[in-house]
């Protein structure tokens, strides 16, 4: 919406936001950070949810791809009045709950969580937060943490997937704007193109999947290329090579002319998938062509 880099990945994005008393005078900065970031995820297949936590976790906007609902959700977010304790685990519970429902529906969509907090979590609260973040991970989520001001980076590294999934903002809330680009770059997993996009019916091929963020997986050995054929059968293939901006994958042999394979990528061995609008189609190839 405001130009600059954008993310075209189709996944479920959860913002888990600290609205405890300590952020009372900084809620505007948190809101503008989320608003700016939200507008950069532009795939029509991307769904978003806003969750806030203090002494209780509340889903301010339940998972939706509807841009009007997202606009209204942002309006509700702007009106939040912070207060209470830092029960971060409650925020993760609310995300896990939604992931669980979506998995049960059969939508095995990849989930990305961006959790923001401003303080150190006392021992028991840290234990609960780590436990609930692990539950989100068990359900297939990738977890990022944004720490502002008095955060404990060691704690956040254990709540997030790794130290590389933590974004420290040491210069206070006004510096949140400065990390939007790096969060976008790290949290965005997108499929942009496939080469070739047309393959010969009945023949074996390798496909280069162009995109971004393929090495953001906790374990690159768990990355899969997935081909949803004619909107029914899904075939998963292990890539020969995983780089941040491309995957080299064996394409399934599609026997008939006119078959379509929609391209998806899993970062967790098929537990959930990043969707795209990239399609591979089959054509008739004569001998020697």
């Amino acid at each position: 919406e405001d130009g600059g880099p954008a993310c075209y990945g189709g996944f479920d994005l959860y913002f888990i936001l600290d609205k405890s008393g300590s952020v009372l005078h900084h809620w505007n900065e948190i809101y503008y950070f989320v608003e700016q970031l939200a507008h950069k995820f532009i795939s029509p297949q991307l769904r978003m949810s806003f969750i806030v936590f203090s002494t209780r976790g509340t889903t301010l906007m339940k998972l939706t791809e509807d841009r009007e609902q997202i606009r209204q959700g942002l309006e509700e977010l702007q009106k939040v009045l912070p207060g209470g304790d830092t029960y971060m685990h409650e925020g993760f519970e609310r995300a896990s709950e939604q992931i669980y429902y979506e998995n049960r529906q059969g939508y095995r969509t990849a989930s990305v969580i961006i959790a923001l907090t401003d303080g150190e979590l006392h021992e028991d609260l840290f234990f609960y937060s780590e436990r609930e973040a692990n539950r989100s991970r068990d359900l297939g989520a990738i977890v990022y943490c944004v720490g502002v001001k008095d955060f404990n980076e060691t704690q956040l590294a254990r709540i997030a997937d790794s130290k590389d999934h933590v974004f420290p903002v040491n210069d206070g809330f006004q510096a949140l704007q400065g990390i939007i680009h790096s969060i976008l770059k790290k949290s965005c997993i997108e499929i942009l193109a496939a080469e070739p996009s047309t393959i010969c019916a009945g023949e074996s091929f390798q496909v280069v999947v162009r995109g971004n963020g393929f090495r953001h997986a906790r374990n690159v050995d768990r990355v899969l290329c997935s081909f949803k054929i004619n909107d029914s059968v899904t075939l998963n293939e292990k890539p020969f090579s995983v780089e941040d901006t491309y995957l080299l994958c064996p394409a399934p042999i599609l026997k008939e002319v006119g078959m379509k394979a929609a391209l998806q990528v899993s970062m967790n061995d098929g537990l959930s998938f990043i969707s795209s609008s990239v399609i591979i189609t089959t054509t008739h190839c004569s001998d020697g062509s």
Epitope: L60, E97, Q98, Y100, Y101, R135, D138
Partner: antibody, heavy 117, light 106 residues
């Protein structure tokens, strides 16, 4: 298909410990995200959630009964066991086990436990 | 934990629409699930995650949730829908049930 069945004593004496077993089939407790809950319902009254065990062995308990409850699982036997100490006549109820994580999609038929001397 | 409040009873004529409410502080910010329980039987999940219907549940059952009230709606109520209905939510690692509503089909 998914099935759950509760078993245990029909009658227990006050102050005794109740042990209930839930034997299930059609799903695995080693699968991410799910779990098994115990719920009870006194005659003519509402449902009351007691305890839950997750696939990763995390446990949670009803705040009001926490000190009296223990939940455990035996994944290889497809069983979940609930023990409740210091039984009282007010604990007379039908005890159900059910599958789920954040809601309960399959229930056993329940077992009536009467607490009486 | 959140408290879920239901009316003890609701009556409806056959073929009409029954609405059963479940209220709680900012309940729209959490998810609500609904169970049907007939006498002598175990509860059956009829709606989960506010408005999703499990397979095998008739289309006449629907759910909504916003503000401080979640609602189970049964359109074209049939005699077989007479039962107790419970709302349920998840809060601080606990499952919480409402007190139940007895639906009478006149």
């Amino acid at each position: 298909q998914v099935q759950l069945k509760e078993s245990g004593p029909a009658l227990v004496k006050p102050t005794q410990t109740l042990t209930l077993t839930c034997t299930f089939s059609g799903f695995s407790l080693s699968t991410s995200g799910g779990g098994v809950s115990w719920i009870r319902q006194p005659p003519g009254k509402a449902l009351e959630w007691l305890a839950h065990i997750y696939s990763n062995d995390d446990k949670s308990y009803s705040t009001s009964l926490k000190t009296r409850l223990t939940i455990s699982k035996d994944t290889s036997k497809n069983q979940v066991v609930l023990t409740m100490t210091n039984m009282d006549p007010v604990d007379t109820a039908t005890y159900y086990c059910a599958r789920g994580g954040y809601f309960l999609d399959y229930w056993g038929q329940g077992t009536l436990v009467t607490v009486s001397s | 934990d959140i408290e879920l409040t239901q009316p003890p009873s609701v009556s409806v004529a056959p073929g009409q629409t029954a609405r059963i409410s479940c209220s709680g502080d900012n309940i729209g910010g959490i998810y609500v699930h609904w169970y049907q329980q007939k006498p002598g039987q175990a509860p059956v999940l009829v709606i989960y995650a506010d408005s999703k219907r499990p397979s095998g549940i008739p289309e006449r059952f629907s759910g909504s949730n916003s503000g401080n009230t979640a609602t189970l709606t049964i359109s074209g109520t049939q005699a077989e829908d007479e039962a107790d209905y419970y709302c349920q939510s998840y809060d601080i690692t606990s499952l919480v049930f409402g007190g139940g509503t007895k639906l009478t089909v006149l």
